[in-house]
């Protein structure tokens, strides 16, 4: 059955309640210089209205503080209102290493990111840090790497490993959850000139992730004791016509091309899914495509296999698919899939259908295919036009969390966290945020607060309290001081 009745119950005490933000652009200078200037000034208020320095007088300055960054103060205020336990954000690789290698490290950018993490920890909020977060509009690579063919060039994977190592070294004492790459399976939207570009770039992304994971495992895990994975875009697929065999096959093929493409080599075999490889090869043989999945060497298979500490999935919606034979040598046509928009379903302004049961099906599919491992939903959300009373978002959160709870309670999926997407929206972009682009709070925040404080959807009489050892102890005085801090 697609929909089952709501359940009452709670998530475990160590469940991560998170909120996700995309790339944080580092502020280059702290915006409160008044504390670092040792000079005394007299303000000529009635005359020329200028400040005149008083010579010979030097005041005591205070050291620079993280909250001097205006940007950080804003984020902390928003996070405090969210009442989350975890904050997922992404670093900007191009800002940290503008030359693409360790010859020029932007220490100020690293200091900024360290501040975001350490100030969050003061509020009892742990960070899940994403090292690389490409978007359709912005590949996010340092410029020199772009000029050398970006992800089509195997040396970009080595450059990524060096960058990851720097981040582990500089932030790893404070960060215990790492995502190497956000949605590498969606870079097909960018590397789309040919299927071979798509599969070549994907191959180098897989290698980049594996190199970073191996580096962490070897060099940093013993002391830092964190966990590293990568986030896959993981929408569920359903046959448009459940009575057509070809539609069922298309739905499974979608999952193979979208999720298994990256999951199989990392979680299971070290190689691409046999079904995907065979499907592309069969189209190649029939002259319908010149695409081919890269052949992996034994060394590459060994490198890739098992390089995840948990499964991280970004899930937003369920797609209705049907089979349609497509000619052409691009990833989109290699899949032979056509998407159908079901107009009877509740949908968002960007036409994301609200289909809560899809997330439960996804979680069961992942466990069935890749075994019983810790799973985090590292991004999940919907765009809602409302600037204050965002009812669609509240409905979405409630229903999707219900299905995640069913997966935990009934299906016994080891779900460890849910990260709502996203903290604040960007100007002239779809409205996914809990806060507007000018930091105004929406009513879905209270809804999410309530779910977090209840740890789900408890029975009337059940306690939502966890023992102090398991729950972060909140220091009320600290919180008060942080909020009052200039």
């Amino acid at each position: 059955k697609e929909s089952t009745p709501d359940v009452q119950g709670q998530f475990p005490c160590d469940f991560s309640w998170g909120v996700t933000e995309s790339v944080l652009k580092p502020e280059s200078v702290a915006s409160s210089p008044q504390f670092s200037d040792p000079h005394l000034y007299v303000w000529n208020a009635t005359g020329n209205r200028l400040l005149h320095r008083v010579e010979g007088v030097r005041l005591k300055t205070r050291p620079a503080q993280c909250t001097d960054f205006v940007n950080i103060k804003k984020q902390l205020e928003m996070l405090a209102r969210m009442k989350v336990t975890h904050y997922r954000f992404a670093l900007d690789w191009a800002s940290v290493l503008p030359t693409g290698n360790l010859s020029a490290v932007n220490r100020q950018a690293l200091r900024y990111y360290r501040c975001v993490v350490s100030e969050g920890l003061k509020l009892g909020i742990s960070a899940m840090v994403t090292l690389y977060y490409p978007t359709h509009a912005h590949l996010g690579l340092p410029e020199p790497l772009l000029h050398a063919d970006g992800w089509l060039n195997p040396s970009t994977a080595e450059a990524f490993q060096a960058y990851a190592g720097l981040c582990f070294q500089e932030l790893g004492d404070l960060v215990k959850l790492w995502i190497t790459i956000n949605e590498p399976n969606r870079l097909s939207d960018i590397y789309n000139r040919s299927g071979n570009d798509t599969y070549g770039a994907a191959h180098n992304l897989l290698v980049a992730h594996a190199l970073a994971w191996r580096l962490y495992d070897r060099q940093f895990r013993p002391s830092q004791r964190g966990a590293v994975s990568l986030s896959l875009h993981a929408d569920w697929a359903e046959p448009a016509n459940p009575y057509a065999d070809s539609h069922w096959r298309a739905a499974e093929r979608f999952l193979q091309f979208e999720i298994a493409w990256f999951a199989e080599p990392l979680f299971k075999t070290g190689d691409y899914p046999a079904a995907m490889r065979e499907y592309i090869a069969s189209k190649h043989r029939r002259g319908l495509s010149s695409s081919a999945l890269p052949r992996l060497t034994e060394a590459e298979r060994r490198l890739l296999k098992g390089t995840v500490d948990f499964c991280a999935l970004n899930h937003f919606t369920t797609r209705f698919v049907m089979h349609e034979q497509l000619a052409g040598s691009r990833y989109d046509s290699d899949r032979d899939i056509q998407f159908l928009q079901d107009i009877t379903r509740l949908s968002s302004p960007t036409r994301l259908a609200v289909i809560p049961w899809g997330v439960r099906k996804l979680l069961r599919w992942v466990r069935r295919n890749y075994g019983d491992m810790d799973i985090y939903i590292t991004a999940s959300g919907i765009d809602d036009q409302a600037l204050e009373d965002d009812r669609l978002r509240k409905y979405y959160l409630g229903k999707y969390l219900q299905e995640v709870l069913k997966a935990y309670l009934i299906d016994k999926v080891r779900i460890k966290g849910y990260y709502a997407f996203k903290l604040a929206e960007e100007k002239s972009k779809p409205r996914f945020g809990f806060f507007t682009s000018d930091f105004k709070a929406k009513s879905s925040i209270q809804f999410y607060n309530k779910v977090i404080s209840s740890r789900g959807f408890p029975f009337e009489n059940s306690s939502s309290r966890c023992s102090q050892t398991q729950e972060n102890t909140e220091c009320t005085v600290c919180l008060f001081l942080v909020q009052k801090k200039p």
Epitope: E143, P144, L146, H147, D149, G150, W151, N153, R193
Partner: antibody, heavy 122, light 107 residues
Amino acid sequence: EVQLQESGPGLVKPSQSLSLTCSVTGYSITSGYYWNWIRQFPGNKLEWMGYIRYDGNSNYNPFLKNRVSITRDTSKNQFFLKLNSVTTEDTATYYCTRKGAYYSSFDALDYWGQGTSVTVSS
Amino acid sequence: DIVMTQSPSSMYASLGERVTISCKASQDIRSYLSWFQQKPGKSPKTLIYRANRLVDGVPSRFSGSGSGQDYSLTITSLEFGDVGLYYCLQYDEFPLTFGAGTKLKIE
């Protein structure tokens, strides 16, 4: 500022080889980009001849494939064009140009040399 | 090879006039098209890339449009310095191929 400068003989005899040099300043040819040779015939028609990439890989116009080769000297930051068995049809102005990588912020031809005129005549 | 058919081969236009030059590819080139200007005795200069993106420093009176197989370059208000040869180039596939050129003159 990136600059490209072509050099080579202005006159070549038929059946001989034409050799041109492109000297690049302001950017290392091993750091990135595709380094191309393009020629313009007397009637203004333009023809792409081939490229050598930042990593030394090259690609040629199939129309010229067995006659053309593009190589480089990374120590001098130069790349070269060699065209064998020339005929009068190869009389043209030869340009070296730089092309951005696909998927980069600028993926087209950006810098051109000023061109060098080559006449094939006995 | 992809064939680029450019039209017109030459044209006269008045100062201040709006000028449009067209290029048709023999197959879909997915916006991998650029436009060049060449003045007599000079090397070509790139004006537009990716069909509609203006190169830094190029006056905003130049604009590019189109997709699939059909593309055009527009000069909104012709100036005296705009005379010369204009070419389109497809770079979706190697070998790169050029249009035959349009000679633009002031009448």
